[in-house]
């Protein structure tokens, strides 16, 4: 069942999933200058069975300048240096990830995707903060939000972290010592 | 709480124009596209089109281009429809919807007559 | 466009009772098939995306299944508050298109 609302909001933090349930939408978001095509889902669906899941359909963007075709164009320096990051954090984590069962792996990027991805999570789906570069991390407790359902209504729970104007970026779980991952996990791409 | 509060009902006269709202609260306006479904007794649901608040892209059903025009103010989270030269067929409710067909505004009936 | 065809536009059951509303598309749509209920004189309601999922809050007894041209919303131990018309839809390709509704009736 998907959850109503995005996962909270913390000041100077982002949030990401080390793997994403059975059910989670990821929308075919494009960036600027570029769109869907205009034949496609409009968002990848996380699908599978007990023993495997994988992503269902296939992001596609096509130059919002030529309507019909499929003509990439090449990125930016900026845009390079983005593209590079997240293709090397996809490598990583498609050769290191342990496989959940009912749980998908980041998926990898398509070509003029958006800078931000936009999700939508599943109950039972859990999140892991991170404070900014340039933030610390003052942890009250598991810095990590997961969406729940109560009374018919679903919710996520509070993170508790906050973030403060110091040095040292906190870590997601995965990023230190390798018993730090949830459920041995490593790290996933991040979502937001 | 996410919430699409539509405008109210418009009567409204032959060949003119009319432009409604949707409102959206409880979610990041520039990250999901809004769509807009058309309602008339005995003819089901019809897909006008969507817009992408963030891009300013817009996608329309070859019934309504020329019909519907759609845009978005980011700045107050509001999706606009305006439909022009009205004619008894426009007369209809007029649906806006968000995140992937998830949440529905409460719907703004139009009734076109002179 | 892709046509949705909704055989049956009214359907009887009675309270207790498994029911299942049928859409046929014109052409293979994946998986990318929603469902709503309406309620007279209020909005659509989704209840399933992706043909198979549901949206939080909707009761287990709708169950959706399906791929590629032939798609069903089963209703199982139907409630009187199911009183409504079902559409299918479509969202693989542009311009999206919705069934022509299905009417439940409770006996």
């Known amino acids: 069942e998907l959850c109503d609302d995005d996962p909270p909001k913390i000041t100077h933090a982002t949030f990401k999933a080390v793997a994403y349930k059975e059910g989670t939408m990821l929308n075919c978001e494009c960036k600027r200058g570029f769109r869907r095509i205009k034949s496609g889902s409009p968002y990848m669906l996380c699908t599978g069975n007990s023993s495997h899941s994988s992503w269902d359909n296939q992001c596609q963007c096509t130059s919002s300048a030529a309507r019909n075709t499929t003509k990439q164009v090449t990125p930016q320096p900026e845009e390079q240096k983005e593209r590079k990051t997240t293709e090397m954090q996809s490598q990583m984590q498609l050769a290191d990830q342990v496989s959940l069962p009912g749980h998908c792996r980041e998926p990898p990027p398509w070509e003029n995707e958006a800078t931000e991805r936009i999700y939508h999570f599943v109950v039972g789906q859990t999140v892991y903060y991170q404070c900014v570069q340039g933030y610390r991390a003052l942890h009250r407790g598991p810095a990590e939000s997961v969406c729940k359902m109560t009374h018919g209504k679903t919710r996520w729970t509070q993170p508790q972290l906050i973030c403060t104007g110091e040095t040292e970026p906190s870590q997601f779980p995965g990023e230190e010592e390798p018993q730090a991952s949830p459920d041995g996990l490593p790290e996933s791409e991040t979502s937001r | 709480q996410i919430q699409l509060q539509q405008s109210g009902a418009e009567l409204v006269r032959p060949g003119t124009s009319v432009k409604m709202s949707c409102k959206a609260a409880g979610y990041t306006f520039t990250n999901y596209w809004i769509g807009w479904v058309k309602q008339r007794p005995g003819h089901g649901l019809e897909w006008i089109g969507d817009?992408?608040?963030?891009?300013?892209?817009?996608n329309y059903n070859e019934k309504f281009k020329g019909k519907a025009t759609l845009t978005a103010d980011t700045s107050s989270s509001t999706a606009y429809m305006q439909l022009s030269s009205l004619t008894s067929e426009d007369s209809a409710i007029y649906y806006c919807?968000?995140?992937?067909?998830?949440?529905w505004g409460q719907g703004t009936p139009v009734t076109v007559s002179s | 466009d892709i046509v949705l065809t909704q055989s049956q536009k009214f359907m009887s059951t009675s309270v207790g009772d498994r029911v299942s509303v049928t859409c046929k598309a014109s052409q293979n749509v994946g998986t990318n098939v929603a469902w709503y209920q309406q309620k007279p004189g209020q909005s659509p309601k989704a209840l399933i995306y992706s043909a198979s999922y549901r949206y939080s809050g909707v009761p287990d007894r709708f169950t959706g299944s399906g791929s590629g041209t032939d798609f069903t919303l089963t209703i199982s131990n139907v409630q009187s508050e199911d009183l409504a018309e079902y559409f299918c839809?479509?969202?693989?390709?542009?311009?999206?298109?919705f069934g022509g509704g299905t009417k439940l009736e409770i006996k």
């Open positions: 839809q479509q969202y693989n390709s542009y311009p999206y298109t």
């Open positions: 919807t968000s995140r992937n067909f998830a949440y």
């Open positions: 817009i992408h608040p963030g891009g300013g892209y817009t």
